[in-house]
C-alpha cells in the first residue's frame, strides 16, 4: 500500500477514501512533493498582505505587503507599517527621531549620529533627523575656531515593532 502512495506525484494526494488512488489536490491546496497523504491548504494573502505569487497545485502562494507597509521575517511572515524618513515605529505609532539620532529609511529604528571625534575628525555637515553627520578633516587640519566634534547622542529607548 505504501508503494501505491509513493507513486502519487506532486499536485496530488494519496486518497484513503478511494482505495489509495492518487486524487488531485482540492482547490486552494497543494502538494509540493510526491507521496503525500494530504494536500496543504494554500496561504491566504489577506489584510495587510497582498498576493505576490498565486498558489498552484504544486506550490504555495507567496505574499507581499500592501502599500504603506513592508515585509518582516522570512517569506514575508508579517507586515510592518512604514514611517517617514526621520521617524521610527514605536508601540504608539511613528515618532520623530530624538535629537542626535537619524533614520534615512521608511523602516527600522533611529540610530545615533556618527561621533566624528572618535575617528579624530570634525563635523563637516551637521546631522538631521533624516541624515547622519558628515565627518571632515581632523580638527588639527583646520584653522582655530573650526567646528568641533558633535556631542554623543542622548540615551534613548530602542524602537519597537508592533505585534
Amino acid at each position: 500500500l505504501q508503494d501505491l502512495c509513493s507513486n502519487c506525484p506532486a499536485g496530488t494526494f494519496c486518497d484513503n477514501n478511494r482505495s489509495q488512488i492518487c486524487s488531485p489536490c482540492p482547490p486552494n491546496s497543494f502538494s509540493s512533493a510526491g507521496g503525500q497523504r494530504t494536500c496543504d491548504i494554500c496561504r491566504q494573502c489577506k489584510g495587510v498582505f497582498k498576493t505576490r505569487k498565486e498558489c498552484s497545485s504544486t506550490s504555495n502562494a507567496e505574499c507581499d505587503c500592501i502599500s504603506g507597509y513592508h515585509c518582516l521575517g522570512a517569506e514575508c511572515s508579517m507586515c510592518e507599517q512604514d514611517c517617514k524618513q526621520g521617524q521610527e515605529l514605536t508601540k504608539k505609532g511613528c515618532k520623530d527621531c530624538c535629537f542626535g539620532t537619524f533614520n534615512d529609511q521608511k523602516r527600522g529604528i533611529c540610530r545615533p549620529w556618527t561621533n566624528c571625534s572618535l575617528d579624530g575628525k570634525s563635523v563637516l555637515v551637521n546631522g538631521t533627523k533624516e541624515r547622519d553627520v558628515v565627518c571632515g578633516p581632523s580638527p588639527a587640519d583646520l584653522s582655530p575656531g573650526a567646528s568641533s566634534a558633535t556631542p554623543p547622542a542622548p540615551a534613548r529607548e530602542p524602537g519597537h515593532s508592533p505585534q
Epitope: 482547490p27 486552494n28 494530504t38 496543504d40 491548504i41 494554500c42 496561504r43 491566504q44 494573502c45 489577506k46 489584510g47 498576493t51 504555495n60 518582516l72 521575517g73 522570512a74 517569506e75 511572515s77 508579517m78 505585534q163
Partner: antibody, heavy 118, light 112 residues
C-alpha cells in the same frame, strides 16, 4: 505525515506561569505558522496566538499581556508561556499548524489538559 | 473581534438521513479575493478537532464527499448528505478573515 505533540506540566498553581512545548515530527517547522488553541472543559475553542518559524508572533488581544510564544527550529519545537494563571485558564491546550496566520488549522496535536489549582 | 453564532446547538439525526448546521458571522467574511474565510471543524468525542471545510466550501483532502459547505458573506451552512455513526461529535465554524480567529459555540451532532 506531520504530527504534533504537546508536553508540559498538567498542574499549575494560581499566579504561576503555565509552560507547554509542541514538538513537530514528520515535517519541518519551516514555512508555516504555528498556533496554540485552548478549550476549557466542556466549552468551546479559543485561539491563543501564533508564531512563524522565523519568530514573528501574533497574540489574541484578550491574552496578549500574559502570553509569550517562542520557537526553536533546531529542535522542531515551539512553546507557550502563559503567566499569572487563574482557575479560568484550566483547559485542554492544543498546538496546531496554521496554514495562513490565523486560519485553516490543518494539523492538530492531541491536546494536553492543564489544571490550575493550589 | 468577529462573533460567530451557530444553530442548532444540538442536532439528533437518524443514520442515513441528511443534516444541516448553520453559522452566522457578525460581519462579512467575503474578502476582496473572492473567497469566504470560513472553516468548519469536527471534534469527535475525546479527540482533537479536525478540519473539514476551508474557504467556505472547499473540502480538505481526505474528507468524505458527503460533507459540503456553502454560503457567502455572513451566512454559512455545513451539510452532511447522509449521516453515518462516525460523524458524531461537535461541529465548529471558525472565521479566518481577521485576527483573532474566532469559533462558533459548537453544534453537537448525536445519533437518534
Amino acid at each position: 505525515q506531520v504530527q504534533l505533540q504537546e508536553s508540559g506540566p498538567g498542574l499549575v498553581k494560581p499566579s504561576e506561569t503555565l509552560s507547554l512545548t509542541c514538538t513537530v515530527s514528520g515535517g519541518s517547522i519551516s514555512s508555516y505558522y504555528w498556533s496554540w488553541i485552548r478549550q476549557p472543559p466542556g466549552k468551546g475553542l479559543e485561539w491563543i496566538g501564533y508564531i512563524y518559524y522565523s519568530g514573528s508572533t501574533n497574540y489574541n488581544p484578550s491574552l496578549k499581556s500574559r502570553v509569550t510564544i517562542s520557537v526553536d527550529t533546531s529542535k522542531n519545537q515551539f512553546s507557550l508561556k502563559l503567566s499569572s494563571v487563574t482557575a479560568a485558564d484550566t483547559a485542554v491546550y492544543y498546538c496546531a499548524r496554521d496554514q495562513s496566520g490565523g486560519g485553516s488549522f490543518q494539523h492538530w496535536g492531541q491536546g494536553t489538559l492543564v489544571t490550575v489549582s493550589s | 473581534e468577529i462573533v460567530m453564532t451557530q444553530s442548532p446547538l444540538s442536532l439528533p439525526v437518524t443514520p442515513g438521513e441528511p443534516a444541516s448546521i448553520s453559522c452566522r458571522s457578525s460581519q462579512s467574511l467575503l474578502y476582496s479575493n473572492g473567497y469566504n474565510h470560513l472553516d468548519w471543524y469536527l471534534q469527535k468525542p475525546g479527540q482533537s478537532p479536525q478540519l473539514l471545510i476551508y474557504l467556505g466550501s472547499n473540502r480538505a483532502s481526505g474528507v468524505p464527499d458527503r460533507f459540503s459547505g456553502s454560503g457567502s458573506g455572513t451566512d454559512f451552512t455545513l451539510k452532511i448528505s447522509r449521516v453515518e455513526a462516525e460523524d458524531v461529535g461537535v461541529y465548529y465554524c471558525m472565521q479566518a478573515l481577521q485576527t483573532p480567529p474566532t469559533f462558533g459555540q459548537g453544534t453537537k451532532l448525536e445519533i437518534k
